[in-house]
Interface confidence: low
């Protein structure tokens, strides 16, 4: 008789999840000499231990502590780029501006980027059929708790000027319910962080509005100011030119009309 399995509302664990995590770990540690000491089998064991045999709606940050310990990594605290709803451009940016880092440029972020995973209570099986959806099922699921944990630690590590890339095409440019709005903003340390600088990425080619005046940006400014951190905002009117200008800021087209 087939065992009854809980049906969740979200997609199941990414296929070949264990192999993917292990392969990513090996690749990352090869590329980043400062992480060569990491034992990828131990990393996988710690990752697995965080959610296997546990109810996928009852995961805690504590479950991920062994993994956090193994993945401890020092990134330059003044070179951190946060993002919200504009991951691809943020990642393209750090690929060009190699001295800046998004969470997904760290080992733990790289391991989990774009993956889904969950287990089942009291069995060692990984659930490839379905996993809890954050809204429809529960917020304390393995994926959400992982990102909350690593995002909090990443924000806590930041210092000096922290940059955040925001999507100017969305109705809520700053969304209090995003990971940035609900976790990272509240875990920047005012004694270390002087300024949060928002880069609002415009979508339309002819859009010359000052989106730094958007009500949601003003809301972000208010939250940040109350935390004794200075706030700065810049429009990026032409994202198509943005990366080119990062590569070569002295290019004449970067200091004329963009």
């Amino acid at each position: 008789v087939p065992r009854w399995r809980q049906q969740w509302s979200g997609p199941g664990t990414t296929k070949r999840f264990p192999e993917t995590v292990l392969a990513r770990c090996v690749k990352y540690t090869e590329i980043h000499p400062e992480m060569r000491h990491v034992d990828c089998q131990s990393v996988w064991d710690a990752f697995k231990g965080a959610f296997i045999s546990k109810h996928p709606c009852n995961i805690t940050e504590e479950d991920y502590q062994p993994l956090m310990k193994l993945g401890t990594q020092t990134v330059p605290c003044n070179k951190i780029l946060l993002w919200s709803r504009i991951k691809d451009l943020a990642h393209q940016f750090t690929q060009v501006q190699r001295d800046m880092f998004t969470l997904e440029d760290t080992l733990l972020g790289y391991l989990a980027d774009d993956l889904t995973w969950c287990g089942e209570f009291n069995t060692s099986k990984i659930n490839y059929q379905s996993c809890p959806d954050w809204r429809k099922d529960c917020s304390n699921n393995p994926v959400s708790v992982f990102w909350k944990t690593v995002s909090r630690r990443f924000a806590e590590a930041a210092c000096d000027v922290v940059h955040v890339m925001l999507n100017g095409s969305r109705s809520k440019i700053f969304d209090k319910n995003s990971t940035f709005g609900s976790v990272e903003v509240h875990n920047l340390q005012p004694e270390k962080v002087q300024t949060l600088e928002a880069w609002v990425i415009h979508g339309g080619r002819e859009d010359s509005r000052d989106l730094c005046q958007d009500p949601t940006i003003k809301e972000l400014e208010s939250i940040i100011s109350k935390r004794n951190i200075q706030f700065s905002c810049k429009n990026i009117y032409r994202p198509d030119k943005f990366l080119q200008c990062v590569k070569n800021p002295e290019d004449s087209s970067c200091t004329s009309e963009i």
């Epitope: 000096d160 009117y237 963009i258």
Partner: nanobody, 126 residues
């Protein structure tokens, strides 16, 4: 009312030096990053240098690195730009400004800043 007043410009020979000054009033100077930008005749606005609130962070356009030094006196609400080994291509009107609304690579005109001064002319010529 925010006021930024530049001074110290003039005519100087190539290789010479000038010290520009920007007197700020009407806002909390010490809480603002400050910027020097310039506009050469018939050219677009160009970022020159940036200084953080406490003066520890300084950033320069590549072509002025090692020749220009930006500094500030928060007690006097004054922004300074020491320009050494001046070249003919440094000829421009120099402005101090605050509250940029764009990345410096995207600078188009003075309206890209919340506030700016009237400018001071620097001419490098033999």
């Amino acid at each position: 009312e925010v006021q930024l007043v530049e001074s110290g410009g003039g005519l100087v020979q190539p290789g010479g030096s000038l010290r520009l000054s920007c007197a700020a009033s009407g806002f909390t100077f010490s809480s603002n990053w400050m910027y020097w930008v310039r506009q050469a005749p018939g050219k677009g606005l160009e970022w020159v240098a940036t200084i953080s609130t406490d003066g520890r962070g300084t950033y320069y356009k590549d072509s002025v690195k090692g020749r220009f030094t930006v500094s500030r006196d928060n007690a006097m609400s004054t922004l300074l730009l020491q320009m050494n080994n001046l070249k003919s291509e440094d000829t421009a009107v120099y402005y101090c400004a605050k509250e940029p609304r764009v990345l410096m690579a995207y600078l188009r005109n003075l309206g890209d800043f919340g506030s700016w001064g009237q400018g001071t002319q620097v001419t490098v010529s033999s």
